[in-house]
């Protein structure tokens, strides 16, 4: 999915009002300096691409974050403010339901959510100095 035509300001507002708090709740008890940045993004569409990938694609050591509160709110925000996004996700959602497993918060999931926090911060960053 191409995130170029999303309403970035609305997504930013959704992040600031709820998604950020859910991410903090998930990470509670973890030091903010515990994980180094291992993924980056270079503009808002790119950030949303990487956020979608880390939030909804299973990775080794962290089978699924898709049922977490921050993930469901992320999905809702993208569906509302990214034209055509929800249609592209129907097949992916059906496949996810079949894969659903017992919820376990592993260290790998904590690291992944830490990277998500970094990506969201970059998505919301103020303009850099005019260099």
């Amino acid at each position: 999915y191409d995130f170029t035509n999303c309403d970035f300001e609305k997504i930013k507002a959704a992040y600031l009002s709820t998604i950020s708090k859910d991410l903090i709740t998930y990470m509670s008890g973890t030091k903010s300096t515990e994980f180094n940045n291992t993924v980056s993004c270079s503009n808002r569409p790119h950030c949303l691409t990487e956020i979608q990938s880390l939030t909804f694609n299973p990775t080794a050591g962290c089978a699924s974050l898709a049922k977490e509160m921050f993930a469901m709110k992320t999905k809702a925000a993208l569906a509302i403010w990214c034209p055509g996004y929800s249609e592209t996700q129907i097949n992916a959602t059906q496949a996810m339901k079949k894969r659903r497993k017992r919820k376990v918060t592993t260290n790998k999931c904590l690291e992944q959510v830490s990277q998500l926090q970094g990506l969201w911060r970059r998505f919301n960053r103020p303009l850099l100095k005019q260099q």
Partner: antibody
Framework: QMQLVESGGGVVQPGRSLRLSCAAS????????MHWVRQAPGKGLEWVAV????????HYADSVKGRFTITRDNSKNTLNLQMNSLRAEDTAVYYC???????????????WGQGTMVTVSS | SYVLTQPPSVSVAPGQTARITCGGN??????VHWYQQKPGQAPVLVVY???DRPSWIPERFSGSNSGNTATLTISRGEAGDEADYYC???????????FGGGTKLTVL
């Protein structure tokens, strides 16, 4: 653990070519801009070239423009520097470094390799 | 082309504060990054975006940037701080990375 490992350095005659490589691990390589920086013996750091995270664009220092080419293979997590028409003044330790990128601005170089030595001598 | 000017050397007594400057025209309009390099080692980022610090760098390292001068401040200097320090900017208008000439910090 995030790591950059350079290879390909050595002794080469003036006018000849050399290809340096940088293997990245421990981070999502395709999301970062990548630089080559060099350091001549006893001298300071000199920037050589940068490539965008996607590989779509490249920029070079005037001292190497037209002779050096920076490329990347995001599927293999590797960065390369093809150095042609080498000169004695290209003798240096060559470092690769990663850099987050925002739009067309490259940020700080937060991870560096240990460097590979290139000596241009007849 | 843009030039960043650093003093070749700076000395500090143990426990005292060292200040390393980086001069350039309107440098305050650029984001300045600072690197520490010890002999035989690769550079290490110590301050980025003028005044931010990577999580692994001690709070003794701080930075500021305004007007024509950026400054790296190292408080409570230690022997382990002895190194070369380089400032760096990215000039997007000309698509160039620029390093300062480097400053050798000696802890007396």
């Amino acid at each position: 653990q995030m790591q950059l490992v350079e290879s390909g350095g050595g002794v080469v005659q003036p006018g000849r070519s050399l290809r340096l490589s940088c293997a990245a691990s421990g981070f999502t390589f395709r999301t970062y801009g990548m630089h080559w920086v060099r350091q001549a013996p006893g001298k300071g750091l000199e920037w050589v070239a940068v490539i965008w995270y996607s590989g779509s664009d490249t920029h070079y220092a005037d001292s190497v423009k037209g002779r050096f080419t920076i490329t990347r293979d995001n599927s293999k997590n590797t960065l390369n520097l093809q150095m042609n028409s080498l000169r004695a003044e290209d003798t240096a330790v060559y470092y690769c470094a990663r850099s987050p990128q925002w739009e067309d601005i490259f940020e700080s170089m937060d991870v560096w390799g240990q460097g590979t030595m290139v000596t241009v001598s007849s | 082309s843009y030039v960043l000017t650093q003093p070749p050397s700076v000395s500090v007594a143990p426990g005292q504060t060292a200040r390393i400057t980086c001069g350039g025209n309107y440098i305050g309009s650029f984001s300045v990054h600072w690197y520490q390099q010890k002999p035989g080692q690769a550079p290490v980022l110590v301050v980025y975006d003028d005044s931010d610090r990577p999580s692994w760098i001690p709070e003794r390292f701080s930075g500021s940037n305004s007007g024509n001068t950026a400054t790296l401040t190292i408080s409570r200097g230690e022997a382990g701080d002895e190194a070369d320090y380089y400032c760096q900017i990215y000039v997007s208008a000309s698509r160039l990375v620029v390093f300062g000439g480097g400053t050798k910090l000696t802890v007396l």
